[in-house]
């Protein structure tokens, strides 16, 4: 499992380091989740050939995973702190159902999948403290999520493997874009 936030998973940590700022804590939390995703992707790619599949675009279109777009205000051109923060939180909330789906998809990395899910919940809490306009954040409908989960779990084995691969890849990319945007806030 990756080193929990607050400890340094890298080679050299500076001695006598000042306490982490809120931004640095969020940064560290995202890195922790990304480390977890890397481990899960390793298992997925070793177990199946999904990571090289050319049919992924087909499956991706049916998933509707959160993505950053220009209008979200997270890119340099048209950067808007509040709009972007709302997008990041909304996107993470939308990813939660997909992270729930991942929970029974791993054999050797079961704990890792749970760690990614729980760490994401913590990240959402960190970010909600940072947001001024919580009313603008739309929470996904639990009933819709439940039926989506059922639908995903009813897929054949090949589609389930593909779905797992696409969720991990999209979540990684969403977090990377979020990390870069959050640094500017």
């Amino acid at each position: 499992a990756p080193v929990p936030p607050g400890e340094d998973s890298k080679d050299v940590a500076a001695p006598h380091r000042q306490p982490l700022t809120s931004s640095e804590r969020i940064d560290k939390q995202i890195r922790y989740i990304l480390d977890g995703i890397s481990a899960l992707r390793k298992e997925t790619c070793n177990k199946s050939n999904m990571c090289e599949s050319s049919k992924e675009a087909l499956a991706e279109n049916n998933l509707n995973l959160p993505k950053m777009a220009e209008k979200d205000g997270c890119f340099q051109s048209g950067f808007n702190e509040e709009t972007c923060l709302v997008k990041i939180i909304t996107g993470l909330l939308e990813f939660e159902v997909y992270l729930e789906y991942l929970q029974n998809r791993f054999e050797s990395s079961e704990e890792q999948a749970r760690a990614v899910q729980m760490s994401t919940k913590v990240l959402i809490q960190f970010l909600q403290k940072k947001a001024k306009n919580l009313d603008a954040i739309t929470t996904p409908d639990p009933t819709t999520n439940a039926s989506l989960l059922t639908k995903l779990q009813a897929q054949n084995q090949w589609l389930q493997d593909m779905t797992t691969h696409l969720i991990l890849r999209s979540f990684k990319e969403f977090l990377q874009s979020s990390l870069r945007a959050l640094r500017q806030m």
Epitope: T21, E173, R180, R183
Partner: antibody
Framework: QVQLQQWGAGLLKPSETLSLTCAIY????????WSWIRQPPGKGLEWIGE???????NYNPSLKSRVTISVDTSKNQFSLKLSSVTAADTAVYYC??????????WGQGTMVTVSS | DIQMTQSPSSLSASVGDRVTITCRAS??????LAWYQQKPEKAPKSLIY???SLQSGVPSRFSGSGSGTDFTLTISSLQPEDFATYYC?????????FGQGTKVEIK
């Protein structure tokens, strides 16, 4: 071992368009940001801009009106175009990879000279 | 833009010396700073990221410290292969900006 190989015209006349391409070998194109950085002779480094595999770009405002960075995911390549070049654009141009922090992998550099 | 100022712009040192290079940002950048080494006619090479984390394969005589606006790169015992130019770079915001460089020469 990920490597970046870059190429393009090395000698241009003023007002022409600089065009460089960078290919990624031995690694994934997705999930990274791909930048262009330049270094005029005997001077420091200047970041030009970057592209994500999805095609979203960020540019240095000082060059934005003249720069286009594009991507060809099918070939694992990204390109730089800099229009209306002048002698001030004479530099070594590097492509580089960035994930979360630093530019951890660099191309070999291409010397571009603008001269009439 | 965030300005990055390095000092000194050049220094002379001997093999075995302890060398310190400083980098100052015009505004706070937390610990989002990288250090690079560049040798003549070569591309820069990443040494340190996140102000103090060593890139894999970089000798432990290199270390980085600092947070906010003031940062330091230290070479604990200078080796012949360390004579080069060193650059700091911030990645808190756009555009990414570099220091002007510090050239480490043989005394």
């Amino acid at each position: 071992q990920v490597q970046l190989q870059q190429w393009g015209a090395g000698l241009l006349k003023p007002s022409e368009t600089l065009s460089l391409t960078c290919a990624i070998y031995g690694g994934s194109f997705r999930g990274y940001y791909w930048s262009w950085i330049r270094q005029p002779p005997g001077k420091g480094l200047e970041w030009i801009g970057e592209i994500f595999h999805s095609g979203s770009t960020n540019y240095n405002p000082s060059l934005k009106s003249r720069v286009t960075i594009s991507v060809d995911t099918s070939k694992n390549q990204f390109s730089l175009k800099l229009s209306s070049v002048t002698a001030a654009d004479t530099a070594v141009y590097y492509c580089a990879r960035e994930e979360l922090d630093d530019f951890d992998i660099w191309g070999q550099g291409t010397m571009v000279t603008v001269s009439s | 833009d965030i300005q990055m100022t390095q000092s000194p712009s050049s220094l002379s040192a001997s093999v075995g010396d302890r060398v310190t290079i400083t980098c100052r940002a015009s505004q706070g950048i937390s610990s989002w700073l990288a250090w690079y080494q560049q040798k003549p006619e070569k591309a820069p090479k990443s040494l340190i990221y996140a102000a103090s984390s060593l890139q894999s394969g970089v000798p432990s005589r290199f270390s980085g410290s600092g947070s906010g606006t003031d940062f330091t790169l230290t070479i604990s015992s200078l080796q012949p292969e360390d004579f080069a130019t060193y650059y700091c770079q911030q990645y808190k915001s756009y555009p990414r900006t570099f220091g002007q460089g510090t050239k480490v020469e043989i005394k």
